[in-house]
Amino acid sequence: VTGSRVYPANEVTLLDSRSVQGELGWIASPLEGGWEEVSIMDEKNTPIRTYQVCNVMEPSQNNWLRTDWITREGAQRVYIEIKFTLRDCNSLPGVMGTCKETFNLYYYESDNDKERFIRENQFVKIDTIAADESFTQVDIGDRIMKLNTEIRDVGPLSKKGFYLAFQDVGACIALVSVRVFYKKCPLTVRNLAQFPDTITGADTSSLVEVRGSCVNNSEEKDVPKMYCGADGEWLVPIGNCLCNAGHEERSGECQACKIGYYKALSTDATCAKCPPHSYSVWEGATSCTCDRGFFRADNDAASMPCTRPPSAPLNLISNVNETSVNLEWSSPQNTGGRQDISYNVVCKKCGAGDPSKCRPCGSGVHYTPQQNGLKTTKVSITDLLAHTNYTFEIWAVNGVSKYNPNPDQSVSVTVTTNQAAPSSIALVQAKEVTRYSVALAWLEPDRPNGVILEYEVKYYEKDQNERSYRIVRTAARNTDIKGLNPLTSYVFHVRARTAAGYGDFSEPLEVTTNTVPSRIIGDGANST
């Protein structure tokens, strides 16, 4: 049973005489009169088992003390630390010829852990141990004891274990502590790679190459390697591991990002606070979830703030110029936190009687510079119909507008285009022809371009060829032209007038009056 004593992390103790409770029971030769196990009290009044010999009276001493079998535990080189106190020969009266001030240290490798006798010739000498000039003063009870510490190493070892032996040749000596240990490079984490306990090499100058394994939640960047030096120190770290996404290095470990933090990639960076308008509710987030109403575009980096669609453009102004409209507006009050704002124009043609019944304007309308993706805050719309109700919507859009289920990003204006001269009348008919009159009827122009104030009928005898014509005006879409000559060819033109002026005359309608008093009723453009 051994008590706990603290030694450096790079030393693994195989034997510590100070930690043994009770007698050590090592083998002495001779059994009597040589090495003797003695219990002394240390400074804490705890008994220490020591071995002492002080056969200084007789010459040619040869007293051996052998430890129990010591397991090698895979070590190829072991270290022996001996703490001992040696009495100066000149402090002992009358022993100058026989007293010595050194002892010898031996070892013997063996697979047998129960060898009962000391066979001196089996042992290999490690060194002769002498007291140093410098010694440690250690309290043993109330007494100051001169304690020397000597360390020797031995190797390479190959058998399962070994025995140590101490040969006294006539010194007055006490072995206060014998510790046998080997050195290892202790388990360590370097550059996020864990390197296991590694026993040092057999040679005092050897380096043992060790491959590390990435700690939990990390991955190799470059193959992690280190070298275990003979003194139990790790040397020359090569390569490293990086914490996985969602993890950062803390105290040599890859720990999950805390709530409210994230890490998108396997890098050596620390977790970052969630960008504005985003959050993480779990530890180990690789990205942050956007707040309600905020979004992240496909090409937005995880580090970018979440953004939202812009609010509606402001201060929309329209300027109607006949069948053209110029629109200007101001940027939205809230751009949603993005720079990639643009504008789309939606044109709707609405009925005069019921403005809610609107239809898309269609492809005949033209937009300058363009209808969609406008980067400027103005647009010119041309080729509109005159005297028509139009609703124009200006939409502010950005990279996340498409994610918004409830758009409120547009401003609209409804305008009516100016009245223009109407288009020509497509169909003029002679409804009734007599000897002296012609009853005309026609359709409203395809594009009235305003309110038709009146129609103007121009007619003349065909032979006159417009050198002499007459004008009749009417608000109705029919009129009787009287006072005509019988059996005469007349040419009729009709045009409409709005506030903006007259439209073009219709195609000529040629009609010949009758010679007989009967009526001719026709609906063609050329009645004869």
Epitope: E32, G33, V38, I40, M41, Q52, C54, N55, V56, M57, E58, P59, T85, L86, R87, L92, G94, V95, G97, T98, I140, G141, D142, R143, I144, M145, C172, I173, A174
Partner: antibody, heavy 121, light 106 residues
């Protein structure tokens, strides 16, 4: 077992001599020095000196030079104390004691039973 | 010559009590001091050497301390067989004994 055996009581006249033997057994005689101690009746202990059993070299304490001689016969593992010109004040118990040197200190760890020497006319 | 003075000359204690004996040297003897017990009609017995190290077979109720000039022998719980005369002895320079302390039954 380790022991020191001394001879029985001696009665001597003043001016005579006495040789007190101390026979060692149970250990290697020459490995330990031998010390001699005197105790007068009703008095304390007085160290007389010691002898190196290996070399035969004696060391005498103050007051015990001249008439007192330490000697050895290693062949029979025996130490001797010889007192010559005995005086009445030499009346005492004389002890031999094995001297043990250790790294922690010295001491007389094995004692003979003592020999009473009485000097009386 | 180094003189050792022991005190008290006589110490009366009851069995089971603690006994403390003192020994003072006229000059420093470092730790080179021993204690002996002597019962009437018997040879002395080595108790302590090196100022504090118990000799083989000595019960652990006997303990000692000190260095230089002041030394103490303590019997933690006096047993009937402990009533005797106790001597200190120095071996720093030549060897000398103290005059002894008698521990008697109270």
């Amino acid at each position: 077992q380790v022991q020191l055996l001394q001879s029985g009581a001696e009665v001597k006249k003043p001016g005579a001599s006495v040789k007190v033997p101390c026979k060692a057994s149970g250990y290697t005689f020459t490995s330990y020095a031998m010390s001699w101690v005197r105790q007068a009746p009703g008095q304390g202990l007085e160290w007389m000196g010691w002898i190196n059993t290996n070399t035969g070299n004696p060391t005498y304490a103050q007051g015990f030079t001249g008439r007192f001689v330490f000697s050895l016969d290693t062949s029979v593992s025996t130490a001797y104390l010889q007192i010559s010109s005995l005086k009445a004040e030499d009346t005492a118990v004389y002890y031999c004691a094995r001297v043990r040197f250790t790294v922690y200190g010295d001491g007389m760890d094995v004692w003979g039973q003592g020999t009473l020497v009485t000097v009386s006319s | 010559e180094i003189v050792l003075t022991q005190s008290p000359a006589t110490l009366s204690v009851s069995p089971g009590e603690r006994a403390t004996l003192s020994c003072r040297a006229s000059q420093s003897v470092s730790s080179n001091l021993a204690w002996y017990q002597q019962k009437p009609g018997q040879a002395p017995r080595l108790l302590i050497y090196g100022a504090s190290t118990r000799a083989t077979g000595i019960p652990d109720r006997f303990s000692a301390s000190g260095s230089g000039t002041d030394f103490t022998l303590t019997i933690s719980r006096v047993e009937p067989e402990d009533f005797a005369v106790y001597y200190c002895q120095q071996y720093g320079s030549s060897w000398t004994f103290g005059q002894g302390t008698k521990v008697e039954i109270k």
